[in-house]
């Protein structure tokens, strides 16, 4: 069983899923309002968003005193965060600016990918090896969308029987999408294109918030029960509480290299020939050069206009 990394508003914590009755280890303390969290295991980095400080920050696993600011301007409510461990990029959602953005892992070369038809974007999940990203939107027209990580091929994949889609996670081995709905109180799964939808846990969960997966087990935080729960990812059986008495459980991830499988990085050689951003793409050559917001890509498709 994995270590579970979760945001707890005031801090980030790690808890052993097999021994959740033990106290969780505080990874980073003294925080204001930590909401989203993710990591790049191979780089030893943990990222989180703070919705009160309107910032995205990071630390190194073994140097928790060294907190670095990554993105500190132009954020209002960065509710969702995801690390592209292959392309070494950071993606985030902001439910007040109504944007989905991407940058380098250090926050540089920031680009707005989506800014239209977003209402309350929340959870975001990446599949770098296929070049797709997924996000939930719990706004007036709730939905789950998929798009290329380069901003292409945007498509609504779930828009029925959905109300407050909060948690979202991907099963890379089985090519499935899992999500939790806090109003309809369920966990459902589907194929990555939204087809073959099935209930995993039928509507009985008080207020599921964030969702993660490790091997055959789903783990999620619940705002109402102040706990982390788990069940079998196929059947929903074996529902159990593995860690309780959490101050304010927010985002959660299975903290393991297994959740960030290695694959060929199409941007790996010479940044794909891109002068600035090289983003994963679902279509050949499986990457796309891109420029920071406000800077034009030249006709060669590789170089950003001078002054970027």
């Amino acid at each position: 069983a994995p270590l579970l990394l979760y945001a707890n508003r005031r801090d980030l914590r790690l808890v052993d899923a097999t021994n959740g009755k033990e106290n969780a280890t505080i990874v980073v303390g003294g925080l204001e309002d930590a909401a989203a969290v993710d990591f790049v295991f191979s780089h030893g980095l943990i990222y989180w968003s703070d919705v009160s400080e309107e910032a995205i920050k990071r630390t190194e696993f073994n140097k928790t005193e060294s907190v670095q600011n990554v993105v500190v301007s132009g954020l209002l409510s960065p509710d969702g965060l995801a690390c592209d461990w292959l392309g070494e990029k950071l993606y985030w959602t902001d439910s007040e600016t109504n944007r989905i953005e991407v940058s380098n892992l250090d926050g540089s070369l920031r680009k707005v990918l989506f800014w239209q038809e977003l209402d309350q974007p929340r959870a975001i999940a990446l599949d770098p090896s296929s070049g797709f990203m997924y996000w939930t939107d719990w706004g007036e027209v709730p939905k789950i969308e998929r798009a290329g990580m380069d901003g292409s091929s945007r498509f609504i994949i779930i828009n029925s029987e959905i109300y407050w889609p909060n948690g979202l996670t991907l099963d890379y081995e089985e090519q499935k999408l899992y999500w939790a709905d806090a109003k309809l109180n369920f966990i459902h799964k589907s194929n990555l294109d939204g087809t073959n939808r099935q209930a995993v846990v039928k509507g009985s969960l008080p207020h599921p918030f964030a969702l993660t997966l490790f091997e055959d087990i789903l783990y999620w935080t619940d705002w109402s029960t102040h706990s982390i729960l788990a069940c079998n990812k196929y059947t929903g059986e074996g529902l159990r509480e593995i860690h309780s008495d959490i101050f304010s459980p927010m985002d959660i991830h299975a903290f393991s290299q297994q959740r960030q499988p290695n694959a060929t990085n199409p941007c790996g050689i010479d940044n794909g020939g891109c002068s600035h951003l090289c983003l994963m793409s679902p279509v050949k050559p499986f990457y796309q050069c891109a420029c920071p917001t406000g800077v034009k890509l030249l006709e060669n498709g590789k170089t950003c206009k001078d002054g970027a």
């Epitope: 109180n185 209930a199 846990v201 039928k202 509507g203 009985s204 969960l205 008080p206 207020h207 619940d222 705002w223 109402s224 029960t225 102040h226 706990s227 729960l229 529902l239 159990r240 509480e241 309780s244 008495d245």
Partner: antibody
Framework: QVQLVESGGGLVQPGGSLRLSCAAS????????MHWVRQAPGKGLEWVSV???????YYADSVKGRFTISRDNSKNTLYLQMNSLRAEDTAVYYC?????????????WGQGTLVTVSS | DIELTQPPSVSVAPGQTARISCSGD??????VHWYQQKPGQAPVLVIY???NRPSGIPERFSGSNSGNTATLTISGTQAEDEADYYC??????????FGGGTKLTVL
Amino acid sequence: QVQLVESGGGLVQPGGSLRLSCAASGFTFSVNGMHWVRQAPGKGLEWVSVIDGMGHTYYADSVKGRFTISRDNSKNTLYLQMNSLRAEDTAVYYCARYDYIKYGAFDPWGQGTLVTVSS
Amino acid sequence: DIELTQPPSVSVAPGQTARISCSGDNIGSKYVHWYQQKPGQAPVLVIYGDSNRPSGIPERFSGSNSGNTATLTISGTQAEDEADYYCTRTSTPISGVFGGGTKLTVL
């Protein structure tokens, strides 16, 4: 062990009021949804009200505007304030925990307290 | 709200299998739970989440749920199983639906 004990039932005249209590022990009361269910003499079970772990309250249409559910987490106690009582409110009133680990089953139930509305 | 319909009564000989149905529109999309109530006592949970048995409930109790019908099955029924049985379905946050109840008589 997990236990619920109701009290406060009794005989009351139509139009009168009564407050039922349900003392909980053996579990983390504050995070659990708690329900009131009643059973009129010789009849089936009828759901009355719930207060969830976040404090949201809901009522059956038959009691809306007359009954108020509340909780005191510091005392591990659930309440049902019943006003403007009618003869048809005569029933045994049970409190029950919404067990989210059991997919939302009511478990356990209290032993019940009898409310009789009669002149 | 979905109405849950149960037969008012079911009779079974000792040692035989009793089946109590609970029907409702697309009930299979919700979790169904079953309670046993003996005279003068509070209800006791015997099946939760369609087919799970709480600890202390004999193995002869089982449940299933799909489509428009959930079923409580009591295999090798014993005299002590004579009671009223109620189905309900999880419907957060209200959870306001109980079946009308079935009186199980062991002949």
